[in-house]
C-alpha cells in the first residue's frame, strides 16, 4: 500500500529573468527513493538517479542546475516557462509518487508586488 | 477595458461532445493565463483547470481530465473548451476568466450548457 | 487536495453592520517563498464571480476600502466594516497555492 505523500514548494509567480527553487519532499513511506524525474508537460527536464547522480536534459543545461537536494533551480525565466512542473519519485517498493507545481512567470510589467525576482 | 466574451448557452444531447469559446480583448492575450470555473445549479465553484496562451500549455484539475480539453487561437485571442462524452452532471454554467498571481481578476459572462434527451 | 472550509454557510444582516468570512485550508496555503495565493470574490445573482481580494490582503481594484481581508497558513478572514445593499450574494475564497486550485463552500450574505 501506498503511504506517502508528496509535498511541494506550492505555486510560484516570478518575474522574467529571474530565478526559482522548485522542490519536493516525500514524507511518511520507509519506501527507497530510487529515482526522482523532474518534467514540464511531456519533457523531461532532468533526473536524479540514486547512484548514477544528476542528468540534466540538454536542451535546458543553459538555464536549469540540479538541486538544492532533490530540487530544481530555474534561471533566466522566460514566459514560456509559465506551466505545470512534476516532480517524480520512483520509489521501492512502493511504487511512483507524483507532486504538481504551477510556475507563473510574468512580465516586469504585470508582476504582483509578491512575485519572486532573483539574480541568477 | 478587459472583457471576456463567451459564446451563447448550448442544449446537448447526453454523449455527445461540444466546444465553447472565450474572446478576450483589451490586454495582451499571451501575457496571463486563462483559467475555466464549473458552476452547477447554482451551488459551488469548481477550478477546471488553465491554458496558457502563450505556449499552449495546460494544467488541469484532474477530475476533469479528460472530461475537459483547453485550447487558445492566438490569432484571434480566443480560448476554447471542449466538453467530452456529456451527461447530465456535466449541466452547469461554466465561466473563462483571466488569471494572474494564483487569482482570477476578469470573468467572461458565463455559458450555460444542459445537457438532456 | 487541499480541502478549504468556509464560515458561515449563511450569514443575515442588516445594512450597516460589519461582518467576517472565515476561510480554513487543510494545509498551509504559504509557498517556500512566503507567498500565499488565497482569493477572495463576491458573485451576485445574474452575473459573473468578481475578484475583491488577491494575496491575502490585497484589494483589487475599483473594490472598495469597506472590504479587508487577513490571515496566514491556513487561516483567513474577509471583513466587510459597513454592508451596502450591493454587497449581498455569495462569497468564495480561492486556493491557488496548490494544484488543483480550490474554492470554499461560500457564504450567503443575506438581509435579515
Known amino acids: 500500500m501506498m503511504t506517502g505523500t508528496i509535498e511541494t514548494t506550492g505555486n510560484i509567480s516570478a518575474e522574467k529573468g529571474g530565478s526559482i527553487i522548485l522542490q519536493c519532499h516525500l514524507s511518511s513511506t520507509t519506501a527507497q527513493v530510487t529515482q526522482v524525474n523532474w518534467e514540464q508537460q511531456d519533457q523531461l527536464l532532468a533526473i536524479c538517479n540514486a547512484d548514477l547522480g544528476w542528468h540534466i536534459s540538454p536542451s535546458f543545461k543553459d538555464r536549469v542546475a540540479p538541486g538544492p537536494g532533490l530540487g530544481l533551480t530555474l534561471q533566466s525565466l522566460t514566459v514560456n516557462d509559465t506551466g505545470e512542473y512534476f516532480c517524480i519519485y520512483h520509489t521501492y517498493p512502493d511504487g511512483t509518487y507524483t507532486g504538481r507545481i504551477f510556475l507563473e512567470v510574468l512580465e516586469s510589467s504585470v508582476a504582483e508586488h509578491g512575485a519572486r525576482f532573483q539574480i541568477p | 477595458e478587459v472583457q471576456l466574451q463567451q459564446s451563447g448557452p448550448e442544449l446537448v444531447k447526453p454523449g455527445a461532445s461540444m466546444k465553447m469559446s472565450c474572446k478576450a480583448s483589451?490586454?495582451?492575450?499571451?501575457?496571463?493565463?486563462m483559467s475555466w470555473v464549473k458552476q452547477s445549479h447554482g451551488k459551488n465553484l469548481e477550478w477546471i483547470g488553465l491554458?496558457?496562451?502563450?505556449?499552449?500549455?495546460?494544467s488541469y484539475n484532474q477530475k476533469f481530465k479528460g472530461k475537459a480539453t483547453l485550447t487558445v487561437d492566438k490569432s484571434s485571442s480566443t480560448a476554447y473548451m471542449e466538453l467530452l462524452s456529456l451527461t447530465s452532471e456535466d449541466s452547469a454554467v461554466y465561466y473563462c476568466?483571466?488569471?494572474?498571481?494564483?487569482?482570477?481578476?476578469?470573468w467572461g459572462q458565463g455559458t450555460s450548457v444542459t445537457v438532456s434527451s | 487536495d487541499v480541502v478549504v472550509t468556509q464560515t458561515p454557510l449563511s450569514l443575515p444582516v442588516s445594512f450597516g453592520d460589519q461582518v467576517s468570512i472565515s476561510c480554513r485550508s487543510s494545509?498551509?496555503?504559504?509557498?517556500?517563498?512566503?507567498?500565499?495565493?488565497l482569493s477572495w470574490y463576491l458573485h451576485k445573482p445574474g452575473q459573473s464571480p468578481q475578484l475583491l481580494i488577491y494575496?491575502?490582503?490585497n484589494r483589487f481594484s475599483g473594490v472598495p476600502d469597506r472590504f479587508s481581508g487577513s490571515g496566514s497558513g491556513t487561516d483567513f478572514t474577509l471583513k466587510i466594516s459597513t454592508i451596502k445593499p450591493e454587497d449581498l450574494g455569495m462569497y468564495y475564497c480561492?486556493?491557488?497555492?496548490?494544484?488543483?486550485?480550490?474554492f470554499g463552500g461560500g457564504t450567503k450574505l443575506e438581509i435579515k
Open positions: 476568466a483571466r488569471s494572474r498571481s494564483f487569482a482570477m481578476d476578469y
Open positions: 483589451g490586454y495582451s492575450f499571451t501575457t496571463y493565463t
Open positions: 491554458i496558457n496562451p502563450y505556449n499552449g500549455g495546460t
Open positions: 494545509q498551509s496555503l504559504a509557498n517556500s517563498y512566503g507567498d500565499t495565493y
Open positions: 494575496g491575502i490582503s
Open positions: 480561492l486556493q491557488g497555492t496548490h494544484q488543483p486550485w480550490t
